[in-house]
C-alpha cells in the first residue's frame, strides 16, 4: 500500500538449518532444531503507516512462520504502537519447541523526525549543514537512536553534519538514515546546491581625471556570476557609493571637487541567499585645478588719514596647489597698487589724501585667480596739514 514507508534495508541473516546425511543404508529421520535455535538470529524491518501512525514488523525469514497469540500474516506483525514493546512467539513445523520469543522494540513514529537544512545563509556558498530534528515528543529511549549520513564517500554517525570548503554552485547529494536499536526505521536523501559564491575582482583598465570636476574609470568584469557593481569614491573622509548596472564597463564621475585626491573602489556583488560582495579593485586620481572661490569677510580700515589695513579670510575652496593673496588698489580706473602676500593682511600706506579707492582682494592658487572681493573706501584730508595750518593762525 502507498501508505507504507519502507523504513529499512538491513542485511537479512538467513535462518540456520542443518541436514544430516547418513552414511549407512538404514533410513533415519533427521532431528529438527528447536525454533528458539532456528530463529535465534532473526532480523526485523519496521514499516510505518502514515495514516494509522502504526508500525508493521516484517520478519526476515524464508518460510511462513506462526506467531502464537499475535497474528502474523505473511511474516508481518501489524498494528504496533510506537515506543511500545511487543512479544512474539515464533514457531514453524520445521522446528520444535521451545518457540522463539522475539521482543519487538517498536521505534518512534517516522513523522516525528525531520531532516533540516541548518546551513547558515552567509556560508551557504561553501558549506552544507544537515540536522535531524525531533519535531514531536516520544517515549522511546533516545539513547537507542543512532543517525547516519553518507555524502559522496564520506560517512558520519552524527545527528548533525557540516560539510565545509565546498565549491559554490555545485550539487551535493547526502543520504541519511535513523536506526533504533540498530534497526533502520526511516531514511531521507537531500540534494543540495551550494549558493552562488562571491564574484571575482573586476580588473581596472584605467582610472584618471582630465578635468577639475570629472574623472573616468574603465574595467573588465569578473568571470563569476554577479548582479551589479558598487563604485565608491572617497575624498578625505567623505565617501559616496553608486550602484552600477552589470553591463557597464566605464563610468564618468561628475561634480568632483577640483585639485582633490579621490580613491576609487569597485566591486561586483551578487544577491544570492545573502548579498555577496566580491573583492574590490582600487585606484586613485587627483582632479585638475580650478579657480578658487572668493575670499570672504574682507575688511578695509583706516590706520591714518592716507593709510589702510586690508584683511580677509581664506576662500572656502582653494582648488589648487598654492596659496597666495593679491590686493589691487585702484583710484578711478587706474591701478595704483598691486601687492601679493602669503596671508591676506595688507598695510597700504602713502595713499593720496581725500581720494576714493577701490580695493580688490583675491586668492591665487598657483594655477588660477579667484573672483575678487571688492570694497570701496576713501582716504581723509590731511589732518596734520590742517592742524599745522590752523596753528599758524
Amino acid at each position: 500500500s502507498d501508505a507504507y514507508l519502507n523504513a529499512s534495508e538491513t542485511t537479512t541473516l538467513s535462518p540456520s538449518g542443518s541436514a544430516v546425511i547418513s552414511t549407512t543404508t538404514i533410513a533415519t529421520t533427521p532431528s529438527k532444531p528447536t525454533c528458539d535455535e532456528k530463529y535465534a538470529n532473526i532480523t526485523v524491518d519496521y514499516l510505518y503507516n502514515k495514516e494509522t501512525k502504526l508500525f508493521t514488523a516484517k520478519l526476515n525469514v524464508n518460510e511462513n512462520v506462526e506467531c502464537g497469540n499475535n497474528t502474523c500474516t505473511n511474516n508481518e506483525v501489524h498494528n504496533l504502537t510506537e515506543c511500545k514493546n511487543a512479544s512474539v512467539s515464533i514457531s514453524h513445523n520445521s522446528c520444535t519447541a521451545p518457540d522463539k520469543t522475539l521482543i519487538l522494540d517498536v521505534p518512534p513514529g517516522v513523522e516525528k523526525f525531520q531532516l533540516h537544512d541548518c546551513t547558515q545563509v552567509e556560508k551557504a556558498d561553501t558549506t552544507i549543514c544537515l540536522k535531524w530534528k525531533n519535531i514531536e515528543t516520544f517515549t522511546c529511549d533516545t539513547q537507542n537512536i543512532t543517525y547516519r549520513f553518507q555524502c559522496g564517500n564520506m560517512i558520519f554517525d552524527n545527528k548533525e553534519i557540516k560539510l565545509e570548503n565546498l565549491e559554490p554552485e555545485h550539487e551535493y547529494k547526502c543520504d541519511s538514515e535513523i536506526l533504533y536499536n540498530n534497526h533502520k526505521f526511516t531514511n531521507a536523501s537531500k540534494i543540495i546546491k551550494t549558493d552562488f559564491g562571491s564574484p571575482g575582482e573586476p580588473q581596472i583598465i584605467f582610472c584618471r581625471s582630465e578635468a577639475a570636476h570629472q574623472g573616468v574609470i574603465t574595467w573588465n568584469p569578473p568571470q563569476r556570476s554577479f548582479h551589479n557593481f558598487t563604485l565608491c569614491y572617497i575624498k578625505e573622509t567623505e565617501k559616496d557609493c553608486l550602484n552600477l548596472d552589470k553591463n557597464l564597463i566605464k563610468y564618468d564621475l561628475q561634480n568632483l571637487k577640483p585639485y582633490t585626491k579621490y580613491v576609487l573602489s569597485l566591486h561586483a556583488y551578487i544577491i544570492a541567499k545573502v548579498q555577496r560582495n566580491g573583492s574590490a579593485a582600487m585606484c586613485h586620481f587627483t582632479t585638475k585645478s580650478a579657480p578658487p572661490s572668493q575670499v570672504w569677510n574682507m575688511t578695509v580700515s583706516m590706520t591714518s588719514d592716507n593709510s589702510m589695513h586690508v584683511k580677509c579670510r581664506p576662500p572656502r575652496d582653494r582648488n589648487g596647489p598654492h596659496e597666495r593673496y593679491h590686493l589691487e588698489v585702484e583710484a578711478g580706473n587706474t591701478l595704483v597698487r598691486n601687492e601679493s602676500h602669503k596671508n591676506c593682511d595688507f598695510r597700504v600706506k602713502d595713499l593720496q589724501y581725500s581720494t576714493d579707492y577701490t580695493f580688490k582682494a583675491y586668492f591665487h592658487n598657483g594655477d588660477y585667480p579667484g573672483e575678487p572681493f571688492i570694497l570701496h573706501h576713501s582716504t581723509s584730508y590731511n589732518s596734520k596739514a590742517h592742524h599745522h595750518h590752523h596753528h599758524h593762525h
Epitope: 581720494t355 576714493d356 570694497l375 570701496h376 576713501s378 584730508y381
Partner: nanobody
Framework: QVQLQESGGGLVQAGGSLRLSCAAS????????MGWFRQAPGKEREFVAA????????YYADSVKGRFTISRDISKNTIYLQMNSLKPEDTALYYC?????????????????WGQGTLVTVSS
C-alpha cells in the same frame, strides 16, 4: 544714524526723463558713500548707482550705465539721480541709502540708513 528723504518720483512715458533727489540730515560726516537702490513689484531690491561722499567717485549697475547719472551737492547734503531714456522695466520704488561708514560695496548690507522710497512708473 543718517536720516534720508527722497523726492522727484512720478509717472513718465517710456523714453522720458526724471530727476530724483535725496536730502540727508543727522550724522552725515560718518557716511562714506550714498546711493540709490530700487525694488520692482515681486522682485528683490537691487543696486542702481552710488557716489563716494568725499571724493565723488561714481559707480553704476550695468543695466543703467549710460542712461542714469548720480551726483552730489555737499553744501546741501543732497544726492541726485538723473534718469534719461527711461524704460518700462525701470518702474520701481527707488530708495536712497547711506553707508554705515568704513569700507563699502554695492550690496545693501553695507548701507545702514534708508529712506522711505519714491515711486517711479514708466508707461509704454
Amino acid at each position: 544714524q543718517v536720516q534720508l528723504q527722497e523726492s522727484g518720483g512720478g509717472l513718465v512715458q517710456a523714453g522720458g526723463s526724471l530727476r530724483l533727489s535725496c536730502a540727508a540730515s543727522g550724522r552725515t560726516f560718518s557716511t562714506h558713500a550714498m546711493g540709490w537702490f530700487r525694488q520692482a513689484p515681486g522682485k528683490e531690491r537691487e543696486f542702481v548707482a552710488a557716489i563716494a561722499w568725499s571724493g565723488g567717485s561714481t559707480y553704476y549697475a550695468d543695466s543703467v550705465k549710460g542712461r542714469f547719472t548720480i551726483s552730489r551737492d555737499i553744501s546741501k547734503n543732497t544726492i541726485y539721480l538723473q534718469m534719461n531714456s527711461l524704460k518700462p522695466e525701470d518702474t520701481a520704488l527707488y530708495y536712497c541709502a547711506a553707508t554705515n561708514g568704513g569700507a563699502w560695496h554695492y550690496h545693501e548690507r553695507y548701507f545702514g540708513s534708508w529712506g522711505q522710497g519714491t515711486l517711479v512708473t514708466v508707461s509704454s
